[in-house]
């Protein structure tokens, strides 16, 4: 079921509150039954990063699992956790931050000359249709098919971003992922959507650049939490991001 | 080397049924888009179905509730069935799948499907 | 849906003459930064093939003679300088927007 945050692939290596799927204006698709496209530009966030129930690794965002919060807990009451980085103890490969998986019990890098499939540094998406034949362990890799080594220009097809050249990250449009540039400052970004029905997002920003984020833009303050546009902003503070 | 291979192009009746395949080879099937174009003879192009990596699919107007695309990647193969085939329908039809650029950059060398009676 | 209107329809030329293909969008194809316009190539009995995409980026083996460019609704398929291989038709496409559609097509044809 389409229940889960369908995050912004290819987005790596950034707390959840920055990037995130875009919704675009209205445009004629016809898709798997049962898959739902936005309807208007719409910009729907929570402004504090609460924690987030889960069922499935991909209800959370690219930097997260679904897990107990506690050794042991309740198998029935999970949220999405914080990755873990190179060197931590895991038991499956989405425990593991991007760019790593999980070996013996560890997260070590993926690009390793000894790993030849390459860990997607994005989720590979499964949406809950019909075609869907992913597996929990398969979702997050992929064997690279790259057929060139250059990086991608804009408009590349690409599975992650590091297939993509500096300033451009992989994100979805329609049917493929490509290389788009990375938002600029002002620019419109997209929140993690959290709560509510979610549409499936077709259309993919790329996060905000180095020194930005993703914030609700000022004047914009007073709009209904469905509508707040937010846009790239230099930081004024250091961004809270959720430890366990 | 990328290799799309379309058959099961024929002559059928208006109405009857028709259905397509793509041979592919040379990529990681699974993880690529791939679609039908189609080309009325003498006419432009024309697509007329897509399906991504991850499994949903794209139909225009012209076709959507006839026409279903499919893939095996098991099988690294593409389909497209055809049902309620209509004079109009007659053309060229090729899979394309979009490797390096997000355009129709590999294409198979087309299955011709006549409808007529 | 976005309209593409390909002009000239035919293109007399010579061999070693430039050729300037046209193609309008009924609407801006430009988003994300990106020009999602695409050009083919089609020889007779012949599939596609693509020369340009994201408006002006070469695809993969075409010769530095073909270039693009544009951006909104406007663009421009370029040929320096014509080879007797370069006299077939050519498409624009856009992939903005689902469906994607392809321009009528543009003859280029040898004088």
């Known amino acids: 079921t389409l229940n889960s945050v369908l995050n912004s692939n290819a987005i790596k290596n950034l707390p959840p509150p920055l990037g995130g799927a875009a919704g675009h204006p209205g445009s004629a698709v016809s898709a798997a039954p049962g898959i739902l496209y936005p309807g208007g530009n719409k910009y729907q966030t929570i402004d504090n990063y609460q924690p987030y129930p889960c069922a499935e690794d991909e209800e959370c965002g690219t930097d997260e699992y679904c897990a107990s919060p506690t050794r042991g807990g309740d198998a029935g009451v999970q949220i999405c956790l914080a990755c873990r980085k190179r060197r931590k103890r895991c038991m499956r490969h989405a425990m593991c931050c991007p760019g790593n998986y999980c070996k013996n019990g560890i997260c070590v890098s993926s690009d390793q000359n000894h790993f030849r499939g390459e860990i997607e540094e994005t989720i590979t998406e499964s949406f809950g249709n019909d075609h869907s034949t992913l597996d929990g362990y398969s979702r997050r890799t992929t064997l690279s098919s790259k057929m060139y080594h250059t990086k991608g220009q804009e408009g590349s097809v690409c599975l992650r971003s590091s297939d993509c050249a500096s300033g451009l990250c992989c994100a979805r449009h329609f049917w493929s992922k490509i290389c788009k540039p990375v938002l600029k400052e002002g620019q419109v970004c997209t929140k993690h959507r959290r709560k509510g029905s979610h549409g499936l997002e077709i259309f993919q920003r790329c996060y905000c650049g180095e020194g930005l984020s993703c914030r609700i833009q000022k004047d914009h303050h007073q709009a209904s939490n469905s509508s707040r546009l937010h846009t790239c902003q230099r930081h004024h503070h250091h961004h809270h991001h959720h430890h366990h | 080397e990328v290799q799309l291979v379309e058959s099961g192009g024929g002559l059928v009746q208006p109405g009857g049924s028709l259905r397509l395949s793509c041979a592919a080879s040379?990529?990681?099937?699974?993880?690529?888009?791939i679609s039908w174009v189609r080309q009325a003879p003498g006419k432009g192009l024309e697509w007329v179905a897509s399906?991504?990596?991850?499994?949903?699919?794209y139909y225009p107007d012209s076709v959507k509730g006839r026409f279903t695309i499919s893939r095996d990647n098991a099988k690294n193969s593409l389909y497209l069935q055809m049902n309620s085939l209509r004079a109009e329908d007659t053309a060229v039809y090729y899979c394309a799948t979009s490797l390096q650029n997000y355009a129709f950059d590999y294409w198979g060398q087309g299955t011709t499907v006549t409808v007529s009676s | 849906e976005i309209v593409l209107t390909q002009s000239p329809a035919t293109l007399s030329l010579s061999p070693g003459e430039r050729a300037t293909l046209s193609c309008r969008a009924s609407?801006?194809?430009?988003?994300?930064?990106?020009?999602?316009i695409n050009w083919y190539q089609q020889k007779p009995g012949q599939a596609p093939r693509l020369l340009i995409y994201a408006g002006s980026k070469q695809g993969s083996g075409i010769p530095a003679r073909f270039s693009g460019s544009g951006s909104g609704t406007d663009f421009t398929l370029t040929i320096s300088s014509l080879e007797p291989e370069d006299f077939a038709v050519y498409y624009c496409?856009?992939?903005?927007?689902?469906?994607?559609?392809f321009g009528g097509g543009t003859k280029v044809e040898i004088k």
């Open positions: 399906v991504s990596g991850w499994g949903d699919t």
């Open positions: 496409q856009q992939l903005k927007e689902v469906p994607p559609t």
């Open positions: 609407e801006s194809v430009d988003d994300f930064g990106i020009s999602f």
């Open positions: 040379g990529f990681t099937f699974s993880s690529y888009a």
